[in-house]
């Protein structure tokens, strides 16, 4: 199972409004769990059905999240990244990298 990054990417700014059940997605990654070769970034691992992200439709499983509300996600431990999302407020701006 090789997570080597060798694909074309595009970036997008996605603005989500936290719904009744939150933002509605899961993440993996961080400096303590490298899901992609030579990359400790934060990736979307699951979009929850009927959650805010799913209803918006732009965020996809496998996307890399570069920043949250302008805060860079580089060099974060996994739990620190989780906490950043959980404390991001009602309106959440995500800078994401999609695979093409």
């Amino acid at each position: 199972m090789n997570g080597r990054v060798d694909y074309l990417v595009t970036e997008e700014e996605i603005n989500l409004t936290r719904g009744p059940s939150g933002l509605g997605f899961n993440i993996v990654g961080g400096t303590d769990q490298q899901y992609v070769s030579n990359d400790s970034g934060i990736y979307v691992s699951r979009i929850k059905e009927n959650g805010a992200a799913a209803l918006d439709g732009r965020l996809q499983e496998g996307d890399k999240i570069l920043s949250v509300n302008g805060q860079d996600l580089k060099n974060l431990l996994h739990q620190d990244a989780v906490d950043l999302f959980r404390n991001a407020g009602y309106a959440v701006s995500l800078r994401v990298q999609h695979r093409l």
Epitope: G3, N26, V28, Y43, S45, K48
Partner: nanobody, 132 residues
Amino acid sequence: QVQLVESGGGLVQAGGSLRLSCAASGRTFGMSTMGWFRQAPGKERELVSTISIIWRDGRTQSGGRTHYADSVKGRFTISRDDAKNTVYLQMDSLKPEDTAFYYCAARFGSSVDVIIPDDYDYWGQGTQVTVS
């Protein structure tokens, strides 16, 4: 997207052994935990055992942390074959109270939402274990 297929269930006498298998196919990127649950007739589904999946440099590695319900500690052993994307549950010294449908489940990462627990995202159809 993700399929989990259990096998290995059956009828066994008390004191006997069975080995359950759960093969994962489809998307495996982001899989962080695999677990076994069981549900006996008229009872709630309960956790049996889990194994965390270690990712290093884009690959899964063996040696993930394991957890067992008190009722199966010392009798059941969970393991994972990374190459086959399969998790196993070796069940020894089986007791009649182990009779249940056994389900495999997979979790993909951590929820970013406080109010949503880190529940399991995908489930298999289950395999029946009967201990007489």
